[in-house]
Amino acid sequence: EEELQMIQPEKLLLVTVGKTATLHCTVTSLLPVGPVLWFRGVGPGRELIYNQKEGHFPRVTTVSDLTKRNNMDFSIRISSITPADVGTYYCVKFRKGSPENVEFKSGPGTEMALGAKPSAPVVLGPAARTTPEHTVSFTCESHGFSPRDITLKWFKNGNELSDFQTNVDPTGQSVAYSIRSTARVVLDPWDVRSQVICEVAHVTLQGDPLRGTANLSEAIRVPPTLEVTQQPMRVGNQVNVTCQVRKFYPQSLQLTWSENGNVCQRETASTLTENKDGTYNWTSWFLVNISDQRDDVVLTCQVKHDGQLAVSKRLALEVTVHQKDQSSDATP
């Protein structure tokens, strides 16, 4: 006859407070005749968890029908798990005897430990915007998990980052732990539409990691480039001058025209367009009144972007009868 083996496949079982824990136990033989009981702990002080035949165990149910002929599955479910339930659980075979049943064989035990899921990761970016080619820091925090082992990864647009530092606290034993990670990200000019992702993997998540995201649009400032041009055709005594403000982000922008140093208050036509990379272009048209007698006109397009120092571009209109010559130069 085959020697009886008590199989408890899981060495460790992580459970969450309030949930149901399933403790597995199968036997390889129906002999000797006698019950299978569940205990927590070992020795004379061990706690009886389940006795199929007698006692009161309202939180325990069996996975299979123990009364079925040839049943070899003695797995149990324990409902409404609390921290008091942690410990090592043993399924134990008894041989019927007189006056008492005799313990015959014990399973190797399954340690039940409390697992707590990490909170959804929260990713925070820098307080102020930074221009491309500079490095910014993002922090990711998640709390309340147990056990302490946890994996955190950073991604930028799906590409894993390597420049980050992670801490799990506390270092000693605790009911729950927290993780904090800081990643350093170099900004690219096209990062307006980019995202950084903090991904947390933990045993309680059963292979489905939690993610926190931050948009680089909140962290980046792409300064504009300016170009002022004069339209070749003149309409009557008016010349159309265009100021093109290209590739800036965020949208916050103030544009003013000056004529020979005097700020012009009159209305100007303008259009705002969004580029594929999320940056913006702004085009402003300025009509200049000219006459043959008039001195040379210097036009300045000044742009103040996102509260930064103003930048400007000048264009000198050298007005001749035929309007042949045009030149421009820039000042910061």
């Epitope: 004379p44 061990r46 706690e47 009886l48 199929q52 035949k53 007698e54 006692g55 009161h56 008492e100």
Partner: antibody
Framework: EVQLVQSGAEVKKPGATVKISCKVS????????MHWVQQAPGKGLEWIGR????????KYAPKFQGRVTITADTSTNTAYMELSSLRSEDTAVYYC??????WGQGTLVTVSS | EIVLTQSPATLSLSPGERATLSCSAS???????LYWYQQKPGQAPKLWIY???NLASGIPARFSGSGSGTDYTLTISSLEPEDFAVYYC?????????FGQGTKLEIK
């Protein structure tokens, strides 16, 4: 719903035998030990013994050993307790219980000449 | 045979008072196998506390159980009129199973 319904009161003469039944519903009698407990008038509870209806294995308290027989009929979901050589001190209420958690309503046995 | 001795035999208290019922075993009993039952006149005993400290379904939270080894206690924090009854401790750690002689909790 778990229910244990015991047979009615009995009056017996000393030396006689009494057999009390305990019909259960809401569960299969084979799944649990069935215990019997004695309570003499104005006295405490005393465990008589139990049966495992699955294989008819029994355990008895030494005080009752030799005079008591506990049986079970799994086809009718009924447990029985038979007490022989009755004496006046056997006058008591007898309870059946399922695995120490659910109890029958009790059966009064009066032993009187 | 494990002998269970309950004390006091009778406890006279008023509603609102705290009641402490003791159960002493002649040899060590694993806490998993120590149960308490409540019995009122003319009724069958009812499972009240199982495995030393767990309240059976529907039992009010004013009841609690504690103990280990040979000394066990049932405590009622503030007595209600319906709590006056006889309480029995019971061990099923080893055969023969035994009950204490009971503590009668009566209204003073």
């Amino acid at each position: 719903e778990v229910q244990l319904v015991q047979s009615g009161a009995e009056v017996k003469k000393p030396g006689a035998t009494v057999k009390i039944s305990c019909k259960v519903s809401g569960f299969n009698i084979k799944d649990y030990y069935m215990h019997w407990v004695q309570q003499a008038p104005g006295k405490g509870l005393e465990w008589i013994g139990r049966i495992d209806p699955e294989d008819a294995e029994t355990k008895y308290a030494p005080k009752f050993q030799g005079r008591v027989t506990i049986t079970a009929d799994t086809s009718t979901n009924t447990a029985y307790m038979e007490l022989s050589s009755l004496r006046s001190e056997d006058t008591a209420v007898y309870y059946c219980d399922r695995g120490l958690a659910y109890w029958g309503q009790g059966t009064l046995v009066t032993v009187s000449s | 045979e494990i002998v269970l001795t309950q004390s006091p035999a009778t406890l006279s208290l008023s509603p609102g008072e705290r009641a402490t019922l003791s159960c002493s075993a002649s040899s060590s009993v694993s806490s998993s196998y120590l149960y308490w039952y409540q019995q009122k006149p003319g009724q069958a005993p009812k499972l009240w506390i199982y495995s030393t400290s767990n309240l059976a379904s529907g039992i009010p939270a004013r009841f609690s159980g504690s103990g280990s080894g040979t000394d066990y206690t049932l405590t009622i924090s503030s007595l209600e009129p319906e709590d006056f009854a006889v309480y029995y401790c019971h061990q099923w750690s080893s055969y023969p199973y035994t009950f204490g002689q009971g503590t009668k909790l009566e209204i003073k």
